[in-house]
Amino acid sequence: IWELKKDVYVVELDWYPDAPGEMVVLTCDTPEEDGITWTLDQSSEVLGSGKTLTIQVKEFGDAGQYTCHKGGEVLSHSLLLLHKKEDGIWSTDILKDQKEPKNKTFLRCEAKNYSGRFTCWWLTTISTDLTFSVKSSRGSSDPQGVTCGAATLSAERVRGDNKEYEYSVECQEDSACPAAEESLPIEVMVDAVHKLKYENYTSSFFIRDIIKPDPPKNLQLKPLKNSRQVEVSWEYPDTWSTPHSYFSLTFCVQVQGKSKREKKDRVFTDKTSATVICRKNASISVRAQDRYYSSSWSEWASVPCS
Amino acid sequence: RNLPVATPDPGMFPCLHHSQNLLRAVSNMLQKARQTLEFYPCTSEEIDHEDITKDKTSTVEACLPLELTKNESCLNSRETSFITNGSCLASRKTSFMMALCLSSIYEDLKMYQVEFKTMNAKLLMDPKRQIFLDQNMLAVIDELMQALNFNSETVPQKSSLEEPDFYKTKIKLCILLHAFRIRAVTIDRVMSYLNAS
């Protein structure tokens, strides 16, 4: 058993049929010694008496809020949550496996630049009685500070018969140098509590590996005289690290016809302009990627050819 | 993905082309190592990230762009010096790149070159003959060092009398290639910045 926060405790249980569970000692936070009784949750049924109680916790019915009273007055509370371990593996019932980039990916994180700010998100089908708390650090043995905000519900989607909820959190490394070469990964830890079930999820990464620039901005077309060619120009996104000559991007320019089946013409360039042939009803799209470290491409910025 | 090949203009900052070749070569070599040594811990997640130049050179700090010198987090161990030399600078004047930066890059290359050559000598003794260092990568390191044109004492190649542990050598190769790739990215950024200055 360990304390998650004040008066909230997590009991780690090996979960199998007829498991003996864990014996947990609860002590009433009071100077009183006599006449103390204990109840569980909203029930008025007294389960035990005395300042200290030893309870056997082996299933969710044994978890919950234990309250000690004296003469009708509440003295203190202890909330017990369960963390299940089945066949040596901690349960992952609360979050959905996003399966990207690999199986057992529950948390996904992205950074728009090298400033040390990043966003993580996760998915669940659970809509109520759900709380999350996020901690992060650079390295684990001698951790350096990363500050995370509160996790918020960022999207709701309907997937078949199910509703899916996306939660996200923003974190910022306390003293980040954009030019630094990372040798210790960022660790992100999410505590998830659904009713009386506790689970924790972790992710470990280098900022350089989760970089995904915003799409190029101010995408414009300039027709070239007496030609089917156009000059496409764009700018670095505002969110990208500066100076741009140090944090350089490379770009992919794509000409795509109306039909998905039509052949796509693609050009790669380090410049912020390119000359392409604009076909009727086609659109021109540009995306960006770090020029020197191949992490993710940005989403496309697009303009119609007409 | 192969990085786009840049054909340098005659007046272009001379080291940019070499640094791009360097990054391409080390990225290819790392990819080859990860494929060949698929049953060894050779991915970024599996290896310990060690920097053989730590406490010996200060490339990141010495080559910091001017715009980042206002960022206190970047100035932990910054040594500032604005005296420039080395042929890469040609006749361009810049207060961003100091001799310390280029000589630091040169020292990095020299240290990695020695490590890679020592390692290759061991790998050549491996009866499995599983992996060797790409001669192109070693040549590109050499070319960039020549372009930097710094004079420093030659470091003797480390020789070891004991029988090499080929498993450990291959893991060390992965660690070295990951670290060198990260350093090659920094070098490329620096050269790109210098070229624009």
Partner: nanobody, 114 residues
């Protein structure tokens, strides 16, 4: 009508063991929280242990010590195993449906003496 009948008491030497039983009827035993209480001569009721329908147990203090509560829902029976008996364990032992003993049996006498 609720009936609780305790048995298994008797005269035991110090250091000995006993297993008390309580046969329950007249209510749904398998879904009830059950208690063992005792009353020593000239003393008030003392709570010894609690067992939930699932078999999860609750004891006073920081450990179950010498007492072990158990149940067999199929037989509608509650048990109390007492080990290493001491003279101060001499008392009337009750099974009950509440900690205050408002619904309890007639009790079974345990005497510990050499």
């Amino acid at each position: 009508e609720v009936q609780l009948v305790e048995s298994g008491g008797g005269l035991v030497q110090p250091g000995g063991s006993l297993r008390l039983s309580c046969a329950a009827s007249g209510f749904t035993f398998s879904s009830s929280v059950m208690f063992w209480l005792r009353q020593a001569p000239g003393k008030g009721l003392e709570w010894l242990s609690t067992i939930k329908p699932t078999g999860s147990t609750i004891y006073p203090g920081s450990g179950k010590g010498r007492f072990t509560i158990s149940r067999d829902n199929a037989k509608n029976t509650l048990y109390l195993q007492i080990n290493n008996l001491k003279p101060e364990d001499t008392a009337l032992y009750y099974c009950a449906r509440d900690i205050g003993g408002t619904v309890r049996g007639q009790g079974t006498q345990v005497t510990v003496s050499s």
